[in-house]
Amino acid sequence: ELCDDDPPKITHATFKAVAYKEGTMLNCECKRGFRRIKSGSPYMLCTGNSSHSSWDNQCQCTSSAARNTTKQVTPQPEEQKERKTTEMQSQMQLADQVSLPGHCREPPPWENEATERIYHFVVGQTVYYQCVQGYRALHRGPAESVCKMTHGKTRWTQPQLICTGETEPSQFPGEEEPQASPDGLPESETSR
């Protein structure tokens, strides 16, 4: 069951999934000046059996000007570097080391893909939030959102993260809030 809406937005924060539930779709979007190859699938789909999940289909982009020339799917080192993401929190780091059953990992980049990935999430998906660079967590309660089905409708739980650019935290004496990674995510993930 696909989630009806996007995950909630948090001001000055981005979200990321560690792993994607089976049934998740990722649009094959290309950057300006490129388009999906004619025979190419419009999306990748996370599918699997009891032991292994993987992305079906491959996204491929070709120059809008070129005819009958398919660009290779393997990304260049610079592109791989550009898309490298930071770990968000300890629970994400842990999940990142373990292969979650019924989940796909982040798909590798394809050449000339669009800068923003558009996912179609399914019920049960969790996404994690982090304040972007230059902002700090004024309050960090559960910084995640889960797509749930209630009364036949899907809804995302509300993350309890407040990010602020204001300085001078007035914390309790001798107490420090655990810091998120100083780097924000390079880009926000989006669902439609």
Epitope: K9, H139, Q158, T164, F172, E175
Partner: antibody, heavy 115, light 107 residues
Framework: QVQLVQSGAEVKKPGASLKISCKGS????????MHWVRQAPGQGLEWIGV????????IYAQKFQGRATMTVDKSTSTAYLELSSLRSEDTAVYYC????????WGQGTTVTVSS | DIQMTQSPSSLSASVGDRVTITCRAS??????LEWYQQKPGKAPKLLVY???TLAEGVPSRFSGSGSGTDFTLTISSLQPEDFGTYYC?????????FGQGTKLEIK
């Protein structure tokens, strides 16, 4: 069930200080920030500020900066609002409200400032 | 600070009517908007959050829509218990501000 229970009504003289409390129960207190909002008689709602129940870090509306102090006591799951140099315009009902979307509110504390 | 302007400031409607209250933000607030209902002598109650998500336990006759600067709260079929004052509020960034309120009376 989630409950925010506030302290009782207060009558104060101009220039005095006031401290009201808001005790949370039925949920993990430090998961949700706490906001303070007030409502003068017959008027609308006015946001005072927000405090992290986890770190004690707070942000105030400019109007209340320096005169309002929000604190929390995690051991008793209680948030406090202190307002100093009271004036008659501070006569209002003061509410605490939970989380990013103000999903639960206290019942309100009526504060009267009068000489 | 972001200003929130509601209209109308008051309205009177009959049971069964479709009622619409609007809220305009002085700048783009995406969907960072809540709607509350307040009855005399009581604390406000969350109806809608993130512009269109119905809070738990809120009847489905209530709905929210809009994004950016213009938002709407709709009651599809007014019930006697829906009287009270309705407020919009943004949580885009501090300071969070409220609309001035819309008083709804039942004819």
């Amino acid at each position: 069930q989630v409950q925010l229970v506030q302290s009782g009504a207060e009558v104060k003289k101009p220039g005095a200080s006031l401290k009201i409390s808001c005790k949370g129960s039925g949920y993990t207190f430090t998961d949700y920030a706490m906001h303070w909002v007030r409502q003068a008689p017959g008027q609308g709602l006015e946001w005072i500020g927000v405090i992290s129940t986890y770190s004690g870090d707070a942000i105030y509306a400019q109007k209340f900066q320096g005169r309002a102090t929000m604190t929390v006591d995690k051991s008793t799951s209680t948030a406090y609002l202190e307002l100093s140099s009271l004036r008659s315009e501070d006569t209002a009902v003061y509410y605490c409200a939970r989380g990013v979307t103000f999903d639960y509110w206290g019942q309100g504390t009526t504060v009267t400032v009068s000489s | 600070d972001i200003q929130m302007t509601q209209s109308p400031s008051s309205l009177s409607a009959s049971v069964g009517d479709r009622v619409t209250i609007t809220c305009r933000a002085s700048q783009d607030i995406s969907n960072y908007l809540e709607w509350y209902q307040q009855k005399p002598g009581k604390a406000p109650k969350l109806l809608v959050y993130n512009a269109k998500t119905l809070a738990e336990g809120v009847p489905s006759r209530f709905s929210g829509s809009g994004s950016g600067t213009d938002f709407t709260l709709t009651i599809s079929s007014l019930q006697p218990e829906d009287f009270g004052t309705y407020y919009c509020q943004h949580h885009y960034d501090t300071p969070y501000t409220f609309g001035q309120g819309t008083k709804l009376e039942i004819k």
